[in-house]
Interface confidence: low
């Protein structure tokens, strides 16, 4: 399955952090989303395989890596009020 | 705070190889790319290559290509850089940088390690 | 390669001035641009990322702008801790490339 953490975070303006996301069944695509009322979900970063990334609907203020087909970390760069957020990652052959 | 420590100086004839050393801590190594960049005597700077602890896995600049290797382990969290078949142009300061925010992003930096060729 | 090119290579400047450095990029590098300073005879450090991002303890003093091809960063009041050489660096494709630098000298 895909394994996000963490579950919850506050985090403090300027602050950053990393958002964790694995998957163990050998997906290729991994991709970032965020929700929010009214906008459904929209696309921040997404990999098509190791080593390959690219942006989204919405990037700014994230980064992310893929190192390995496993792992797609996110992080956050310096946190804004605007990135408060429900946050999903997810994968795909 | 992130630390990064490199290894001394290091004095190597023409033909032979080197190998420098650099030491993080103040953050998870495993997640890092480190990344080792050189600066001749006078000159600017020059990207060789990256290692993701978490994996080994490694990007080199061309120039660099089947002359230097670069490492990692976790279990020390040390990256190593490798250069061989040295000659009297790889004269320089070479540092170790991590990326932390984004993997090309070269956030902090080593102290420097001085190679110097010479014979 | 992705040639960047800064401009100038050398700049006098006194304490209280607003300085402006340029880097150029070849092609195309998006926001994807770090300054670096470095003090002789010392490492790097870096002071903004993806062209206009502060980090941590940077002092606000420092700005940077642009995106595409052109970049600048600016200094709004030189403090005597400033003079040092300035780089720019791109992160948009491999290798990684840096400016030749330029070199912020005290009048």
């Known amino acids: 399955g895909v394994t996000q953490t963490p579950k919850f975070q506050v985090l403090k303006t300027g602050q950053s952090m990393t958002l964790q996301c694995a998957q163990d069944m050998n997906h290729e695509y991994m991709s970032w989303y965020r929700q929010d009322p009214g906008m459904g979900l929209r696309l921040i970063h997404y990999s098509v395989g190791a080593g390959i990334t690219d942006q989204g609907e919405v990037p700014n203020g994230y980064n992310v890596s893929r190192s390995t087909t496993e792992d797609f970390p996110l992080r956050l760069l310096s946190a804004a009020p605007s990135q408060t957020s429900v946050y999903f990652c997810a994968s795909s052959y | 705070q992130v630390q990064l420590v490199q290894s001394g100086a290091e004095v190597k004839k023409p033909g032979s190889s080197v190998k420098v050393s650099c030491k993080a801590s103040?953050?998870?190594?495993?997640?890092?790319?480190i990344h080792w960049v050189r600066q001749a005597p006078g000159q600017g700077l020059e990207w060789m290559g990256r290692?993701?602890?978490?994996?080994?896995?490694?990007k080199y600049n061309e120039k660099f290509k089947g002359r230097v290797t670069i490492t990692a382990d976790t279990s020390t969290s040390t990256a190593y850089m490798e250069l061989s078949s040295l000659r009297s142009e790889d004269t320089a300061v070479y540092y170790c940088?991590?990326?932390?925010?984004?993997?090309?992003?070269?956030?902090?930096w080593g102290q420097g390690t001085t190679v110097t060729v010479s014979s | 390669d992705i040639q960047m090119t800064q401009s100038p290579s050398f700049l006098s400047a006194s304490v209280g001035d607003r300085v402006t450095i340029t880097c150029k990029a070849s092609?195309?590098?998006?926001?994807?641009v770090v300054w670096h300073q470095q003090k002789p005879g010392k490492a790097p450090k870096a002071l903004i990322y993806?062209?206009?991002h502060r980090y941590k303890g940077v002092p606000s003093r420092f700005s940077g702008s642009g995106s595409g091809t052109e970049f600048t960063l600016t200094i709004s009041s030189l403090q005597p801790e400033d003079f040092a050489t300035y780089f720019c660096?791109?992160?948009?494709?491999?290798?990684?490339?840096f400016g030749q630098g330029t070199k912020l000298e005290i009048k």
């Open positions: 103040g953050h998870d190594f495993r997640l890092t790319y």
């Open positions: 290692v993701y602890a978490g994996s080994g896995n490694t």
């Open positions: 092609q195309n590098v998006e926001d994807r």
């Open positions: 993806s062209s206009s």
């Open positions: 940088a991590v990326s932390y925010y984004s993997y090309d992003v070269l956030d902090y």
């Open positions: 660096q791109q992160f948009k494709s491999y290798p990684l490339t």
